[in-house]
Interface confidence: medium
């Protein structure tokens, strides 16, 4: 069982590349929706929950028309990277209550990472300017209580759901311009 072949595959049509990224984003959106519902079943949310360290929603769906591809991908990458760090943090510091969301939360982390890598490669294949290296992220403070961890989980999954929904719409719209 030797290693896989080394050379990268020939660059496919950017529209096909974007299609596969949309598929991956839709799949992750479905995972997130399911996990958020699971969380609500176990720990019903009392109103909306926010976390100051989460990115603000990139754009309302109505404002998508003015977007350009580099801006969408750069912003999406930055926001999803923030959510990846928050999911990692949640799994480390969220407390025993959130262990009931495993292994689904771990699967979500791995798929989110895969989507980020796909976006990065898409930016490379489309010859878009690469963002500068991310500075080391400041560590997130642990939740003050078990309930604080649950509130954080509601905020993270809810925000990720909105971001991925925006991403699918944005990527589909941009595909028509390629």
């Amino acid at each position: 069982p030797g290693p896989p072949p080394g050379p990268p595959r020939v660059s496919p049509d950017p529209r096909a590349e974007l299609d596969s990224t949309v598929l991956l984003t839709r799949s992750l959106l479905a995972d997130t929706r399911q996990l958020a519902a699971q969380l609500r079943d176990k720990f019903p949310a009392d109103g909306d929950h926010n976390l100051d360290s989460l990115p603000t929603l990139a754009m309302s769906a109505g404002a998508l028309g003015a977007l350009q591809l580099p801006g969408v991908l750069t912003r999406l990458r930055a926001d999803l990277l923030s959510y990846l760090r928050h999911v990692q943090w949640l799994r480390r510091a969220g407390g025993s209550s959130l262990k009931t969301l495993e292994p689904e939360l771990g699967t979500l982390q791995a798929r989110l990472d895969r989507l980020l890598r796909r976006l990065q490669l898409l930016m490379s294949r489309l010859a878009l300017p690469q963002p500068p290296p991310d500075p080391p992220a400041p560590p997130l403070a642990p939740p003050s209580s078990a309930w604080g961890g649950i509130r954080a989980a509601h905020a993270i999954l809810g925000g990720l759901h909105l971001t991925l929904d925006w991403a699918v719409r944005g990527l589909l719209l941009l595909k028509t311009r390629l």
Epitope: P3, P4, P5, G6, P8, G106, Q109, R114, L121, S124
Partner: antibody, heavy 123, light 110 residues
């Protein structure tokens, strides 16, 4: 066969700079991502940086971010590590290493390593 | 990223089996099936022995095998031989283009 020939190590004072090189042969260099990994004396391995096959994507360990720059010249089959603002804790043997394959980045595992070059940061 | 945890040293007699553990967290070993193992003889460059948790590159004897359970990966060497005496390092992908290595395990074949 795959060969990674390293050079550029030596003794340098804290705060100064050094550039390491890694000349590749025996494979199509421009088709492979590359890592730098280091090993402090008597210690374990530490990942430092990675670069994609075409040089467009670069990532760094937090411990070197903003000080080290990984780059490559595919026309010369050479990988580089520019190290600025060096500190005593950067003292280590530095290895360049080839990634097994690069497509969607599922295979970022190292399959071949250079012989290593020692960097000593001391006043 | 913190280093993965490995035993500092293990020793066995020739012909015996040994298992070296590598414990990480839910953010690295526990999430990603990208664990590799390297063998390093003194003064030499590391050599890939296992990748993607349990796959063996061509040329590596089938005495070497890898597995993973939860946040812990393991390397098992059966039928130990004198030339297996070396340092062994595990490595895990740790999310969005970062990797973390273990501190290393010195294997002594008595």
């Amino acid at each position: 066969q795959v060969q990674l020939q390293q050079s550029g190590g030596g003794v340098v004072q804290p705060g100064r700079s050094l550039r390491l090189s890694c000349a590749a042969s025996g494979f199509t260099f421009s088709s492979y991502g590359m890592h730098w990994v280091r090993q402090a004396p008597g210690k374990g391995l530490e990942w430092v940086a990675v670069i994609s096959y075409d040089g467009s994507n670069k990532y760094y360990a937090d411990s070197v971010k903003g000080r080290f720059t990984i780059s490559r010249d595919n026309s010369k089959n050479t990988l580089y590590l520019q190290m600025n603002s060096l500190r005593a804790e950067d003292t280590a043997v530095y290895y360049c290493a080839r990634i097994m394959g690069y497509d969607y980045g599922d295979y970022d595992v190292v399959d071949y390593w250079g012989q290593g070059t020692l960097v000593t940061v001391s006043s | 990223q913190s280093a993965l945890t490995q035993p500092r040293s293990v020793s066995r007699s020739p012909g015996q089996s040994v298992t070296i553990s590598c414990t990480g967290t839910s953010s690295d070993v526990g999430t990603y099936n990208y664990v590799s193992w390297y063998q390093q003889h003194p003064g030499k460059a590391p050599k890939l022995m296992i990748y993607d948790v349990s796959k063996r590159p061509s040329g590596v004897p089938d005495r070497f095998s890898g597995s993973k359970s939860g946040n812990t990966a393991s390397l098992t060497i059966s039928g130990l031989q004198a030339e297996d005496e070396a340092d062994y390092y595990c490595c895990s992908y740790a999310g969005f283009y970062t990797w973390v290595f273990g501190g290393g395990t010195k294997l002594t074949v008595l």
